[in-house]
């Protein structure tokens, strides 16, 4: 039960996280105009990974895409790459984890296969979350650097007569969405990895052993919920008899660490 819960929760948390990473990547507010010196502005600037926008107090908003690849800062390209890698890994991880879910049956999939898939998706989620956190952090660092550089050159005057106020940018909402989403994906991945440990049948310790009694042959299968006569193949998720309503976990035939021969 705990394994299913951990796996399911890991999947849901990762799903929310990846949705957040996608949202953050698409958002326009990665950096927003710093309003510290002028909280009441008539023109508000904000920028995303793909376009920059200007919102006028008249209500009009104009966004322009970055229609160049070579002209963009290398750091911005790196952030884009990290976020896209994060999304792709996360999406593949989600796909893999759907098939790995304990509550979903696909043919006669081995438990070891489910465990491997859970671990694979967990690792993918961890890497995806790290990519998102790294991307957002690189962008945040870039903003901090530019912020202090523009603060140092805040006013460039022409003969001390005319003031040109440089627009400074600060953290936008997308950064916080990205950090939280990356963290959730990371946590989800860790949960999947933990769930994987509970799913994996430790074959070396728990091999079935046969005892031959004088009257008839009885095989005792450790971890099973019913002993069967002969060498029946009930080591998997198959019910011999369901006398009442039971949850999926109550009818599992996985060995546990407390089952000894």
């Amino acid at each position: 039960m705990a394994v299913t819960a951990c796996q399911g929760l890991g999947f849901v948390v990762s799903l929310i996280g990846i949705a957040g990473i996608i949202a953050a990547t698409c958002m326009d507010q990665w950096s927003t105009q710093d309003l510290y010196n002028n909280p009441v502005t008539a023109v508000f600037n904000y920028q995303g990974l793909w376009r920059s926008c200007v919102r006028e107090s008249s209500g009009f908003t104009e966004c322009r895409g970055y229609f160049t690849l070579l002209g963009l800062p290398a750091m911005l390209q790196a952030v884009r790459a990290l976020m896209i890698v994060g999304i792709v890994l996360g999406a593949i991880g989600l796909l893999v984890s759907i098939f790995a879910l304990k509550c979903i049956r696909i043919g006669s999939m081995e438990d070891s296969a489910k465990a491997n898939m859970t671990l694979t998706s967990g690792i993918m989620f961890i890497v995806s979350g790290l990519c998102a956190i790294a991307g957002v952090s690189v962008f945040a660092n870039m903003l901090v650097t530019n912020f202090w550089m523009s603060t140092a050159n805040m006013y460039t005057g022409m003969g001390g007569m005319v003031q040109t106020v440089q627009t400074r940018y600060t953290f936008g909402a997308a950064l916080f969405v990205g950090w939280v989403a990356g963290g959730l994906t990371l946590i989800g991945g860790v949960m999947m990895c933990i769930a994987c440990r509970g799913l994996a049948p430790e074959e070396t310790n728990y091999k079935a052993v046969s005892y031959h009694a004088s009257g008839h042959s009885v095989a005792y299968k450790p971890g099973g919920f019913k002993a069967s006569t002969g060498f029946g193949s009930n080591t998997k998720n198959k019910k011999i008899y369901d006398g009442g309503a039971r949850t999926e976990d109550e009818v599992q035939s996985y060995p546990s660490k407390h089952d000894y021969v």
């Epitope: 105009q33 502005t41 008539a42 107090s57 008249s58 209500g59 005319v162 627009t167």
Partner: antibody, heavy 118, light 113 residues
Framework: EVMLVESGGGLMKPGGSLKLSCAAS????????MSWVRQTPEKRLEWVAT????????YYPDSVKGRFTISRDNAKNTLYLQMSSLRSEDTAMYYC???????????WGQGTSVTVSS | DIVMTQSPSSLTVTAGEKVTLSCKSS????????????LTWYQQKPGQPPKLLIY???TRESGVPDRFTGSGSGTDFILTINSVQAEDLAVYYC?????????FGSGTKLEIK
Amino acid sequence: EVMLVESGGGLMKPGGSLKLSCAASEFTFSNYAMSWVRQTPEKRLEWVATISSGRSSTYYPDSVKGRFTISRDNAKNTLYLQMSSLRSEDTAMYYCAGLGRGNAMEYWGQGTSVTVSS
Amino acid sequence: DIVMTQSPSSLTVTAGEKVTLSCKSSQSLLNSGNQKNYLTWYQQKPGQPPKLLIYWASTRESGVPDRFTGSGSGTDFILTINSVQAEDLAVYYCQNAYSYPFTFGSGTKLEIK
């Protein structure tokens, strides 16, 4: 054709209050940020107040802050300017204007005259 | 506050002449986000409210004759009337539309001989 019609002006004593109205027609009033602008007897234009399309933000110059309040009723297509603690320097022709691209005052009313005198 | 200075304060010209009206701001009106200058020009004919001519320093409002041209960037702006007509008799105002409080120039009165 866009129509903005101001009303409510008149002769007031210093310290008095007055509420100006601006009725809009022939344009989507609720989509536009609106402003009040006044023109002094010396023909100088002064911006008085701006309100965003959704009523969420209002802006004023220091000269009227705390004395004037801009508001709007999108259901009635009407803009208001509540003026209190009037001073002689508030004497002017008051225009309402609809803001367009570039924060430019795209549409103007014909104006209503406010005179503050003892 | 941004101070807008217009020159000359008045100007008398002959119909058909080319006219240039100047407007200077105490701070740059160029917005780095979209590289647009938030300067607006208005025309006010006698007994009428002001009328929008040009926004973003050089974008002509629809319906405005193409003899009116706005130019300039940063702090120095010009309104050019290529071939002045009798109906251009008016006061021309420039306005800072970049930051609050919005401020207007004192105007240039254009008179026709």
